[in-house]
């Protein structure tokens, strides 16, 4: 069952600056996502971006960017300009669209214990997007790693060891962080395998695009900046989620640059790639 | 109140075309997906396919391929549905219903047209 | 198309009573939606994702399965309860449903 996972961190150079960060754990291959704050989209909730993995991205103040971070994550950075930080208060929400089989959304906002005066350590989770022998190797390796380091600081130090837990943060940034999974089983988050699934739909979909969408012209892909950019390279300066990927995108991050009607798209705007056959042609 | 509104009953002869309006309101209409569903009398429910009210995108059941045709006015909240070249086993009620979204820790509702009872028949 | 088949097709019991409807689906699917039709009334969401309820659904009702095989249970059936429930399932194209199942007050 389809997971999304909301995570709201706060710069420690730029109290007024926060970032959403959020993911989708599924089968369903993306055909929109929607950032809101408030409450949910189309609940109560105020649209702050909307990103199509064709058509580019769209944001309204307070957003200042939103992108993709990978074919199943997007960030979205906001600049708080109030002096007293709504934000700190403020929930925020991602809903994942897959076309037709449903959208998924959950919330999450800045837990009330931040205090950008207290970093907590780096916890070097990998992002797993490779095959699952690399994420089980990987996996094992960090592990053992981590183990290890843990043990010589346990040695060494004679003091407490920091619990590890799925965080954002490096020395630019205080992770503070709301971990919203969907309603689905929670199993999911901690069992690689309880994401893993067989093609979400056959070859014969009888899916049609709009004709107000023009087809959209190819560019040559490029790869994204950032620490996104390899889907074989553990990340290991940001925390981050597990994130099983369906094994039918192409690359992490291989996005021509399109613009649509209405559209603002921005530079390092990208998504996942359109597979055709799944849900025909975007 | 969310609201879907259907036309009314339609008599069609084989052949013939038919177009089921469904007119939303209550809430930000290109929100949700629109999606049909009809029920032959005394059967069970058949998905016929869904529209994105927000840009138009169709997802069809392919038994219809050919035949079926949704679409929306945005500047009405309403979703048309519309079969063609009509045959006696199309007689159904159509409904019409606005897609749920799954959303953590916040109700989750759906929400159905009254329903549409198109009778094909010579 | 993936076939949902549910058993049993009719099922007679009484105010107060447990009931188990079944949903299997004859290959293998993620999730799995149930809904509820009362005569001459549109049908209604009553679980989605398996095992969640909708909004307003009281909490003698639950879900559960995975795979090909699903289950609805009403722990102590009311009288309102009896209608025609429906499985349906979005994993694949089409979507479809399953044939329904009477649930009659015996």
């Known amino acids: 069952t389809p997971e999304v996972w909301v995570q709201v961190q706060m710069e420690a150079t730029e109290l007024s600056s926060f970032t959403v960060h959020c993911g989708f754990l599924g089968p369903g291959s993306i055909s929109l996502v929607t950032v809101s704050w408030g409450g949910p989209d189309g609940a109560g909730g105020t649209k702050l971006a909307v990103l199509h993995p064709e058509l580019g991205t769209r944001q309204w103040a307070p957003a200042r960017q939103a992108r993709w971070e990978t074919q199943s994550s997007i960030s979205l950075a906001l600049e708080d300009s109030g002096a007293s930080s709504p934000f700190a208060n403020t929930t925020f929400c991602c809903k994942f669209a897959s076309f037709p089989e449903g959208s998924w959304e959950s919330c999450g906002s800045l837990p009330p214990s931040s205090d950008p005066g207290l970093s907590a350590p780096p916890t070097p989770v990998p992002i797993l997007r490779a095959d699952l022998a690399g994420i089980l190797g990987l996996s094992g390796v960090l592990l053992f790693g981590c183990g290890y380091l843990l043990h010589l600081l346990r040695r060494q130090k004679h003091r407490p060891t920091p619990r590890l837990q799925p965080s954002h943060t490096n020395s630019q940034a205080l992770t503070a962080q709301a971990w919203a999974p969907s309603q689905a089983s929670q199993a999911a988050l901690h069992d690689p395998y309880a994401t893993i699934n067989t093609s979400f739909c056959p070859a014969t979909l009888d899916t049609a695009h709009p004709n107000g969408w023009a087809s959209l012209p190819t560019h040559a892909a490029h790869q994204p900046q950032g620490p996104a950019a390899s889907a074989s390279t553990p990340i290991l300066a940001r925390g981050s989620f597990v994130s099983v990927e369906n094994g039918l995108y192409t690359q992490a991050g291989e996005r021509p640059p399109h613009t649509g009607p209405g559209l603002t798209l921005f530079p390092d705007c990208r998504g996942p790639r359109a597979v055709e056959g799944r849900f025909g042609v975007r | 109140e969310v609201q879907l509104v259907q036309s009314g009953a339609e008599v069609k002869k084989p052949g013939a075309s038919v177009k089921v309006s469904c007119k939303a309101s209550?809430?930000?209409?290109?929100?949700?997906?629109i999606y049909w569903v009809r029920q032959a009398p005394g059967q069970g429910l058949e998905w016929m396919g869904t529209?994105?009210?927000?840009?138009?995108?169709?997802s069809y059941n392919q038994k219809f391929r050919g035949r079926v045709t949704m679409t929306r006015d945005t500047s009405t909240s309403t979703v048309y549905m519309e079969l063609s070249s009509l045959r006696s086993e199309d007689t159904a009620v159509y409904y019409c219903?606005?897609?749920?979204?799954?959303?953590?820790?916040?109700?989750?509702?759906?929400?159905w047209g009254q329903g549409t009872l198109v009778t094909v028949s010579s | 198309q993936n076939v949902l088949t549910q058993s049993p097709a009719t099922l007679s019991l009484s105010p107060g009573e447990r009931a188990t409807l079944s949903c299997s689906a004859g290959?293998?699917?993620?999730?799995l939606h149930w809904f509820q039709q009362k005569p001459g009334q549109a049908p209604r969401l009553l679980i989605y994702?398996?095992?969640n309820l909708a909004s307003g659904v009281p909490a003698r009702f639950s879900g559960s399965g995975s795979g090909t095989d699903y289950t609805l249970t009403i722990s102590s059936l009311e009288p309102e309860d009896f209608a025609v429930y429906y499985c349906?399932?979005?994993?694949?194209?089409?979507?479809?449903f399953g044939q329904g199942t009477k649930l009659e007050i015996k």
């Open positions: 219903a606005r897609d749920f979204i799954i959303t953590v820790n916040y109700p989750v509702v759906d929400y």
């Open positions: 209550g809430y930000t209409f290109t929100d949700y997906w």
């Open positions: 529209i994105d009210t927000s840009d138009h995108k169709t």
């Open positions: 290959s293998s699917v993620n999730y």
């Open positions: 994702s398996t095992s």
């Open positions: 349906q399932q979005r994993s694949s194209l089409p979507f479809t």
